[in-house]
Interface confidence: low
């Protein structure tokens, strides 16, 4: 079972805590570790047996406004001869992240946290074969 | 949501940048989607570059549980089910945003934090360096 929301009994912990209106929370979007870099192996998206392309989605009312999504290039996987082997499957690997969504309502704006599913890359898997009786 | 008055020029003027600090609604849109990769698919076992999932738990973060992938082999699994060292299993990494309590003891004050997670593994042709 889930407790949805505790009545709006918002409790302040130390005196130094910022006052926050009921039903909301204060979010600093200056990102901790903003400058860390992904040190992935070089162009694995092209060298993979399940290669993928990247598409950048851009939304000015989302923070961050750029989200990169991967798409598998093939249904099958690339074999040692560089040909597509359809006895194997290229499948997307996905990961959730948080974004902040800005919503305009007339002359007011509100902010909402949102979970977004990002396709990160692809991997080659043995297919699940369903036998029909 | 929590409404905040727009700038005085509304509706003509539009602030393109996000403010440094915002008040956000406590409800997270899509917050109940499945976050356990073991339950959502068995790709980690069926992949030619299989991986194990390790639980990274931090109660002062949201989400408090993040699953980290670690490739099981240096090579990839071939058609015979053996490890082929002519190919490499490599992690696919992704930067994600999480919430961190800041200041640490305040119940409703947070900061976004970028963390690097290994989401899964993929099988790649190795880069061969020829020594002159």
């Amino acid at each position: 079972r889930k407790i949805p929301k505790v009545g709006h009994t918002f409790f302040q912990k130390p005196e130094s805590c910022p006052p926050v209106p009921g039903g909301s929370m204060k979010l600093d979007i200056g990102i901790i570790n903003e400058n860390q870099r992904v040190s992935m192996s070089r162009n694995i998206e092209s060298r993979s047996t399940s290669p993928w392309n990247y598409t950048v989605t851009w939304d000015p009312n989302r923070y961050p406004s750029e989200v990169v999504q991967a798409q598998c290039r093939n249904l099958g996987c690339i074999n040692a001869q560089g040909k597509e082997d359809i006895s194997m499957n290229s499948v997307p690997i996905q990961q959730e992240t948080l974004v902040v969504r800005r919503k305009h309502q007339g002359c007011s704006v509100s902010f909402q946290l949102e979970k977004v599913l990002v396709t990160v890359g692809c991997t080659c898997v043995t297919p699940v074969i369903h036998h029909v009786q | 949501g929590i409404t905040i008055p727009r700038n005085p020029g509304c509706p003509n003027s539009e602030d393109k940048n996000f403010p440094r600090t915002v008040m956000v609604n406590l409800n997270i849109h899509n917050r109940n989607t499945n976050t356990n990769p073991k339950r959502s698919s068995d790709y980690y076992n069926r992949s030619t570059s299989p991986w194990n999932l390790h639980r990274n738990e931090d109660p002062e973060r949201y989400p408090s549980v993040i699953w980290e992938a670690k490739c099981r082999h240096l090579g990839c699994i071939n058609a015979d089910g053996n490890v082929d060292y002519h190919m490499n299993s490599v992690p696919i990494q992704q930067e994600i945003l999480v919430l961190r309590r800041e200041p640490p003891h305040c119940p409703n004050s947070f900061r976004l934090e970028k963390i690097l997670v290994s989401v899964g593994c993929t099988c790649v042709t190795p880069i061969v360096h020829h020594v002159a």
């Epitope: 889930k2 407790i3 929301k5 009994t9 929370m25 | 309590r101």
Partner: nanobody
């Protein structure tokens, strides 16, 4: 699977005492702040108390300060609420809750134990 089982509720006279217990299993108990939350008849949920992972810090809603004490035993995976000087307005179902850090969203909670304060 995460489980939280409360016990110790009952009927008590005003000014009396009760000790609630919560047995936790299925997660790393010592890694989480734990909470007591209550729901009075016909009312919404009210946060009562929180205790940090190592038990070093406790927080209380104003109406119970000085009367209630939250404690925990990490070796036993147990959470407690010692309730003294009980008043009629403390009558409620008391829940123990394990929470994500997002305030007021508890991802797991028990079935509750009823505390009735009446003469």
């Amino acid at each position: 699977e995460v489980q939280l089982v409360e016990s110790g509720g009952g009927l008590v006279q005003p000014g009396g005492s009760l000790r609630l217990s919560c047995a936790a299993s299925g997660f790393t108990f010592s890694s989480y702040s734990m909470y007591w939350v209550r729901q009075a008849p016909g009312k919404g949920l009210e946060w009562v108390a929180e205790i940090k992972q190592d038990g070093s810090e406790q927080y209380y809603v104003d109406s119970v300060k000085g009367r209630f004490t939250i404690s925990r035993d990490n070796a036993k995976n147990s959470l407690y609420l010692q309730m003294n000087g009980l008043r009629a307005e403390d009558t409620a179902v008391y829940y123990c809750a394990k929470g994500e850090i997002l305030p007021l969203y508890f991802d797991y909670w028990g079935q509750g134990t009823l505390v009735t304060v009446s003469s």
